[in-house]
């Protein structure tokens, strides 16, 4: 039994880091493998993660590490029984993938303006809370070419757009994702999408 692709991990910089790797053949990850993880600190414990399958030879482990700070560094040991298959380390602050925003809502009752709001996925005491920027994706269910991205570079989790920038009388969907420049993070996953019917009063044409 050998590791084909070494574990790579990303942290949500809150409480969970996710590690994925591939073995050299079909593997029952939960019965054959264990990933030990330990904060490099004098009196920290070595926790054990039981991996789950992620495709035939792929394994995934969720490491629980509440109260992450930028200096944290973890040692990782991948075991098959008593055999050490791989040894490495992981610094959560250097591999951050933010949590996805939630509660995306489209408010359509604001005089020909669409107001999209969503929730910051972090509590106020988390460092990322005040450092997230967002991308909002809006697309038409009827027209695959009608697909647009709005970058929200301010901190407020909301976006206002004129309803007239979208076609009237058809259904649209929106979703939002986040990233943080301070830690050079990857983008989060997209939030669940929300749907609305876009309608607005056409401006009265004067001749």
């Amino acid at each position: 039994m050998k590791v084909l692709q070494e574990p790579t991990c990303v942290s949500d910089y809150m409480s969970i880091s996710t590690c994925e790797w591939k073995m050299n053949g079909p593997t029952n990850c939960s019965t054959e493998l264990r990933l030990l993880y330990q904060l490099v600190f004098l009196l920290s414990e070595a926790h054990t993660c039981i991996p789950e399958n992620n495709g035939g030879a792929g394994c995934v482990c969720h490491l629980l590490m509440d109260d992450v700070v930028s200096a944290d560094n973890y040692t990782l040991d991948l075991w098959a029984g008593q055999q050490l298959l791989w040894k490495g380390s992981f610094k959560p602050s250097e591999h951050v993938k933010p949590r996805a925003p939630g509660n995306l809502t489209v408010h359509t009752n604001v005089s020909d303006t669409l107001l999209l709001t969503w929730s910051n996925p972090y509590p106020p005491d988390n460092y990322l809370y005040n450092h997230l920027t967002y991308a909002v994706n809006i697309w038409s269910e009827n027209d695959p070419a009608d697909f647009r991205i709005y970058n929200v570079t301010y901190l407020e989790p909301s976006l206002r757009i004129a309803a007239s920038t979208l076609k009237s009388g058809i259904s649209y969907r929106a979703r939002v994702r986040a990233w943080a420049q301070c830690y050079n993070t990857t983008w989060s996953e997209w939030s669940p999408s929300t749907k609305w019917h876009n309608s607005y009063r056409e401006p009265f044409e004067q001749h």
Epitope: S15, E45, H47, T48, H62, L64, Q82
Partner: antibody
Framework: EVQLVESGGGLVQPGGSLRLSCAAS?????????MCWVRQAPGKGLEWIGC?????????YYASWAKGRFTISRDNSKNTVYLQMNSLRAEDTAVYYC????????????????????WGQGTLVTVSS | DIQMTQSPSSLSASVGDRVTITCQAS??????LAWYQQKPGKAPKLLIY???TLAYGVPSRFSGSGSGTDFTLTISSLQPEDFATYYC???????????FGQGTKVEIK
Amino acid sequence: EVQLVESGGGLVQPGGSLRLSCAASGFSSSSAHYMCWVRQAPGKGLEWIGCIYAGSRGSTYYASWAKGRFTISRDNSKNTVYLQMNSLRAEDTAVYYCARAAFVNRGVSWIWPYYFSLWGQGTLVTVSS
Amino acid sequence: DIQMTQSPSSLSASVGDRVTITCQASEDIESYLAWYQQKPGKAPKLLIYRASTLAYGVPSRFSGSGSGTDFTLTISSLQPEDFATYYCLGSSYSTGSNIFGQGTKVEIK
């Protein structure tokens, strides 16, 4: 300094109740580990009572013999874990230790306490009339 | 619940001796076994976890081995400060129990 300090022990009558406290210092009691209680009757061996997960999930596990009479809780704002003991009997006389534990996890919701790494000095509970 | 059978319950040895203590689990507990040392009036001290990993600050004369149901603690050359009681701790998440062995008291011969 990283340490655990138990308090609340003493003499209690059979059938009575007692609440023990374990104050953590030098680390956050809300970080990813379990806080557990272990006891040792005079001249006897060690006996696991139960554990509470100190992170956001707060799950608890108990030894089968402790379910019902013993309850573990926590107050993260005070960095303190508690052991509530009810319907005490003479055989509950012991030194009660608080300990921090590692865990085994599968996914993010299944977390089981494993070995006890950091121990307090213990507090003596005597159940006698 | 699992049962942990530790043997011997006591032994007499001299400084410099090699000492072996065994612990047997009533079911397969993989490598979820730890060893503790306890001196009178003191809290237990972690020696070894995951059956064979030495805890921080523990001298290398202590070693652990085994997996599944049979485990061993070895002190390669007994020192005066090693006279104490030793406990194994087995953890079984399948039955939901953390069980200590009965203890082994290591006394001066």
